[in-house]
């Protein structure tokens, strides 16, 4: 007889991301004896929560928790049996969640204990849900996208542990509700609220984080048609030949338009309002969302916080990967520059809406807003965040890395389950020939 | 309160040309709305078949795109539908309706609900020699 | 294009009962957190009239025993408390893609 070496046994962990748009289960894996190997942790399968996030059920809590039965149900056929009580659930909530926290803390709460309910009813070992700071995304984003990417430590041929040349990548995302930047700095911020400190692997790490709320893509986009309604009889960033009927109460109801809302205003009253194709004013009203006139620091982004200047290579992914794959697959636009990502904003900003419709087949009302979007992104970047063309050169966008989506979920996980070690490991185990 | 109402021959030779028009009262199709046709099969469900905006931009369903065309007369507040080329398979009953996108909110994000809200009455078409 | 399948084709229900009818579409209809199904009554001899959008939106002037549910590819219109003049053939219509398709509707007859 001889001995049948056994595969060896695989740890599991679940993450449901609870966004302002909708909800994703992630469930990862790896295995058990390279528990503190990098990049080894990667994403064994995903879940879409149908419906929206769990915001939205703010006047029904228990349908939030109902809403998730679906992907847990997948959840309990994607790990094995034996793994369910070993293998950790948890629930992190974005922006979506800190709005309504804002608004409606008591329908917070209710949503959060109707969630808990739920996941609690599961086999897994349920370690929470809450509601993380936007600190906590943009730095669990980082370190996901810096894991996945093995920046932090590399396995050497000797047997030890080294730390590669090559440094973090920074990252940014745009979500529904909100937008984080973070990245590596070697200078100390002059904002103690913007700097993180991290020890991994045995190397320190100073990183930058910013979250700015109500800079989400879908915020955004409510928040130019509050503008639009106040400043205009048309929106210049929907296209030409596009109309809608809005609900005033639907504009105004979010905690993000309250500077556009007027002091007295019907909310059930429905109001029409056209495209009219124009990239220069919708450029200005795009603008009038980002402020400059004040900074308390040596220099900032906007909206008078502090940033350092932008350094080293970077990832964009959420919604700043799906809008420059719009301009790059959808309309085969250019945008390796940053002159070519403000062309290709102007671009479909100039499309009609049945000039659309012919370039993107079979989608519907969702490309209406692709020229905002575009347009949002291009300013974000180079005037928020001042990104110049050499530096926008150092960014790529991309939603997956190693096969693993790339957001703050993996980075949350890895934490919580003490899965980066603070110290490097040891010797690599093995036999000793000396 | 938008008002439209079709008319036409109710019937047609194969081969020919379909013609119908709709009139709108109470709103001029230049303003907004987009101005559908929707037929009705006997016995059957409901099938799109194109529609002429405020704009006078057309978007048509692919499957009948060859043979149709919406145009409008703004003088006279009316749309009209041609289809060429008739069968006994296009024998239904031809509604004209005003559609618009909705704007809508849920979970914080909003979107476009395309809802055609306000119909004809519908006018019957047989296709026969 | 999306192809909308109703069932049942006829139900029957006595005044007072709830009305359950199903709209299964061939591929999702949700984008980004959104249902993109309307749903429309078509009573003998008239119109089509819109009942809900976006799946679960009661348009006005509809009365509350009507609801809607479901996002993805299964959808449900339930109308709690039947009335005999809800007798009328039921439509689901789907505009997340082009061209917009509509079911191929479900008859409510009343006992």
């Known amino acids: 007889t001889r001995d049948i070496r056994e595969p060896p046994a695989l740890k599991y962990g679940i993450v449901l991301d609870a966004g302002s748009s909708h909800t994703s289960m992630f469930i990862y894996k790896w295995p058990a004896d390279k528990e503190n190997d990098t990049g080894i942790v990667g994403q064994h399968s995903s879940c879409d929560v149908p419906g929206g996030g769990i915001s939205s059920y703010a006047d029904n809590p228990s349908g939030a928790g109902q809403s998730l039965v679906g992907c847990l149900e997948q959840a309990l056929r994607d790990v094995p049996k034996e793994r369910h009580a070993g293998t950790p659930l948890y629930l992190g909530a974005t922006a979506g969640m800190r709005l309504l926290n804002l608004t409606n803390p008591e329908a917070s709460t209710s949503v959060l204990t109707a969630v808990t309910h739920t996941l609690t009813q599961y086999p897994f070992d349920f370690r929470g849900a809450r509601i993380l700071s936007g600190q906590e995304e943009g730095v669990f984003g980082w370190v996901t996208a810096n894991y996945l990417l093995e920046n932090f430590i590399k396995y050497g041929w000797v047997g030890r542990w080294f730390r590669p040349r090559k440094g973090t990548l920074g990252a940014m995302d745009l979500g529904g509700a909100s937008t984080q930047i973070t990245f590596e700095t070697t200078s100390p911020a002059e904002d103690r609220a913007s700097e993180v400190q991290l020890r991994l692997y045995g190397q320190h790490y100073r990183v930058y984080t910013h979250s700015f709320l109500c800079y989400g893509r879908d915020q955004v986009l409510q928040r130019l048609l509050a503008s639009a309604l106040q400043t205009h009889s048309f929106h210049p960033c929907w296209p030409r030949g596009f109309s809608t009927h809005v609900l005033l109460g639907d504009v105004y109801q979010s905690p993000c338009t309250v500077a556009q809302r007027p002091q007295t205003f019907n909310s059930s009253a429905r109001v029409s309002l056209s495209g009219s194709s124009d990239p220069h004013l919708c450029r200005d009203l795009v603008s009038g969302l980002f402020s400059f006139s004040s900074c308390p620091f040596s220099r900032c982004s906007f909206n008078g916080v502090f940033q350092p200047p932008v350094a080293g290579n970077f990832i964009a992914f959420s919604a700043f990967f799906y809008t420059v794959n719009f301009l790059r697959t959808s309309m085969g636009l250019p945008v390796a520059t940053l002159q070519q990502l403000e062309a290709a904003a102007v671009n479909v900003c100039n499309q009609t809406w049945a000039q659309l419709q012919a370039r993107v087949p079979g989608q519907q009302a969702h490309l209406a807003d692709y020229c905002a979007g575009a347009m949002f992104v291009q300013q974000l970047l180079s005037r928020g965040y001042g990104f110049d063309e050499r530096a926008f050169g150092g960014v790529i966008f991309q939603k997956k890395a190693a096969d693993t989506a790339v957001g703050w979920a993996l980075g949350y996980m890895l934490n919580l389950t003490n899965l980066i070690p603070a110290d490097p490991p040891g010797l690599r185990k093995g036999t000793d020939f000396s | 309160q938008i008002q439209l109402q079709e008319s036409g021959p109710g019937l047609v030779k194969p081969s020919q040309t379909l013609s119908l028009t709709c009139t709108v009262s109470?709103?001029?199709?230049?303003?907004?709305?987009?101005w559908n046709w929707i037929r009705q099969h006997p016995g059957k469900g409901l099938e799109w078949i194109g529609y002429i905006s405020y704009d006078a931009d057309n978007n048509y369903n692919p499957s009948l795109k060859n043979r149709v065309t919406i145009s409008r007369d703004t003088s006279k507040n009316q749309f009209s539908l041609k289809l060429s080329s008739v069968t006994a398979a296009d024998t239904a009953v031809y509604y004209c309706a005003g559609g618009y996108y909705r704007y809508g909110l849920g979970s914080y994000r909003g979107s476009y609900y395309y809802v055609m809200d306000y119909w004809g009455q519908g006018t019957t078409v047989t296709v026969s020699s | 294009e999306t192809v909308l399948t109703q069932s049942p084709a006829t139900l029957s229900v006595s005044p007072g009962e709830r009305a359950t009818i199903s709209c299964k579409a061939s591929?999702?209809?949700?984008?980004?957190?959104?249902?993109?199904m309307n749903w429309y009554q078509q009573k003998p001899g008239q119109a089509p009239r819109l009942l809900i959008y976006?799946?679960?939106n009661l348009e006005s002037g509809i009365p509350a025993r009507f609801s809607g549910s479901g996002s993805g590819t299964d959808f449900t219109l339930t109308i709690s408390s039947v009335e005999p003049e809800d007798a009328a053939t039921y439509y689901c219509q789907q505009s997340n893609e082009d061209p917009p398709t509509f079911g191929g509707g479900t008859k409510l007859e009343i006992k």
């Open positions: 976006a799946a679960s």
């Open positions: 109470g709103y001029s199709i230049t303003s907004g709305y987009y």
């Open positions: 591929q999702s209809v949700d984008y980004e957190g959104h249902s993109y």
